[in-house]
């Protein structure tokens, strides 16, 4: 499965939006990489 910050952030954003949650602007998962590389 996708192992980058962007992938995981998008997945979490989708889950949270469906559950009424909010993703903080500065949220970055701590156990994945970065698409910016």
């Amino acid at each position: 499965s996708c192992n980058t910050a962007t992938c995981v952030t998008h997945r979490l954003a989708g889950l949270l939006s469906r559950s009424g949650g909010v993703v903080k602007d500065n949220f970055v998962p701590t156990n994945v990489g970065s698409e910016a590389f």
Partner: antibody, heavy 122, light 107 residues
Framework: EVQLVESGGGLVQPGGSLRLSCAAS????????ISWVRQAPGKGLEWVAE??????????HYAEAVKGRFTISRDNAKNSLYLQMNSLRAEDTAVYYC?????????????WGQGTLVTVSS | EIVLTQSPATLSLSPGERATLSCKAS??????VSWYQQKPGQAPRLLIY???NRYLGIPARFSGSGSGTDFTLTISSLEPEDFAVYYC?????????FGQGTKLEIK
């Protein structure tokens, strides 16, 4: 002006150690994730290691070829990145670049230094 | 690890021509592919990220496309300064990996 300046390269014997440094300026270093990428003479690019920002626990990842021999670290107060290289081998001979990057979500930043040459030879 | 295979190894074209460079991944990487340009004695420069997003200051003649396992970098009309080596990379999984490079040379 954004700058990443590597230093610490040189000639070292097989089995020896070397510590590379990367001095950053012109951007908020502490927010950036940093990797070392190397390029053997006349060859392609190879990712070596990554360290995340302090807010991301300064977590690290390594390529299999260097795991257990190389250690990446950072000092945000000094805007500096380090690569401690132990048990060096001939195949570690390369130009080593530090790369800083940051994902804003809608855009990114990606900065490379000019590299420092490491030669492992007897 | 994910292996990236670039083709052709060398591409010989003239200024003004269109260049098409290919990058194929051994496993699906969605759109997590970047393209870098490197000239002799210089550090690589990011051109494209996320498969199709031009990086800051990169001319519009550079474009990227693809998803899954097949990716393409297109230079619509070659300028003299475009002759260099081009690398694709993936950031979908660790370890980050690069293709072996395509050398774009003047015909």
């Amino acid at each position: 002006e954004v700058q990443l300046v590597e230093s610490g390269g040189g000639l070292v014997q097989p089995g020896g150690s070397l510590r590379l440094s990367c001095a950053a300026s012109g951007f908020t270093f502490s927010n950036y994730w940093i990797s070392w990428v190397r390029q053997a003479p006349g060859k392609g690019l190879e990712w070596v290691a990554e360290i995340r920002s302090e807010s991301d626990a300064s977590a690290t990842h390594y390529a299999e070829a260097v795991k257990g021999r190389f250690t990446i670290s950072r000092d945000n107060a000094k805007n500096s990145l380090y690569l401690q290289m132990n048990s060096l081998r001939a195949e570690d001979t390369a130009v080593y670049y530090c790369v800083g990057y940051f994902d804003y979500g809608l855009a990114i930043q990606n900065y490379w230094g000019q590299g420092t040459l490491v030669t492992v030879s007897s | 690890e994910i292996v990236l295979t670039q083709s052709p190894a060398t591409l010989s074209l003239s200024p003004g021509e269109r260049a098409t460079l290919s990058c194929k991944a051994s496993k699906r990487v969605t759109t997590y592919v970047s393209w870098y340009q490197q000239k002799p004695g210089q550090a690589p420069r990011l051109l494209i990220y996320g498969a199709s997003n031009r990086y800051l200051g990169i001319p519009a003649r550079f474009s990227g496309s693809g998803s899954g396992t097949d990716f393409t970098l297109t230079i619509s009309s070659l300028e003299p300064e475009d002759f260099a080596v081009y690398y694709c990379s993936q950031s979908y999984n660790y370890p980050y990996t690069f293709g072996q490079g395509t050398k774009l040379e003047i015909k």
